[in-house]
Amino acid sequence: TPEVWVQVRMEATELSSFTIRCGFLGSGSISLVTVSWGGPNGAGGTTLAVLHPERGIRQWAPARQARWETQSSISLILEGSGASSPCANTTFCCKFASFPEGSWEACGSLPPSSDPGLSA
């Protein structure tokens, strides 16, 4: 069964800046990746970025840079300032859509005791 992993890291240089990394462990080819915060995209979460392998990347504030790391993993950097900036207990979710298998999603957040720079 395919799985999704999520890592959340706070940047040591900017304490309110986050890096989210997500990956898909499965055999299908990825059609779309949706990154959201505040819960899954289908359950009240707010979309931060949508990544398509052919048609490019769309992102919304406070997302600063979304990119493909490999064919099955992505990363997203969030701005650390402004009213919409994330806080330490924010939940981030990644949903990978693979054709024709379907979609798999997982969520993660910064561990309560995390030091800046440590992976969740």
Partner: antibody, heavy 120, light 107 residues
Amino acid sequence: EVQLVESGGGLVQPGGSLRLSCAASGFTFSSYHMSWVRQAPGKGLELVAAISRDGDSTYYPDTVKGRFTISRDDAENSLYLQMNSLRAEDTAVYYCSRHEDYFGFAMDSWGQGTLVTVSS
Amino acid sequence: EIVMTQSPPTLSLSPGERVTLSCKASQSVSNDVAWYQEKPGQAPRLLIYYVSHRFTGIPARFSGSGSGTDFTLTISSLQPEDFAVYYCHQAYRSPWTFGQGTKLEIK
């Protein structure tokens, strides 16, 4: 304008074979996942075959697995469904459809359908 | 397999009425739910995708809502051309499945 035009339907005896074609135009065919969906008389919709945009992944429900084969020719902008060992219960209108990644794989374009009748 | 159950199977209504069609999934399907309209002799037509997003050209009287396992399609004021069969569909997990359909007929 997106257009999908099916052909190849007709009357065939039980145990016989038929090859359906779908000619696509008005969009970049190679960038889309495609499917065949059927509707038997008085029944609902059933997805009987799907193929990923790269042609590497296919899907068949148990009802047609081993008998139906979906394929595509991106150079010809065409989708095919080879149907072997046909049964009376395969009698239906067969639709060619296009999946939109950004719509959660919803089928945003359909052909007008081609009727397949399996009867002796 | 995720089973999509639509209710009721048939509804008899008059033009101008408001109608809500129900679709229940046997397990969570996230937001990967679409609604299609089918008329006799015509191909199915996409109305709603991602639970609540209207497809291009679909009138505002059509709206979708729900989450998890319970979804609805609402037509705020039925027009004569709305009498048809409506199907919900999940593309969250293979095998992708449709509901059995709800037929809207004129009273």
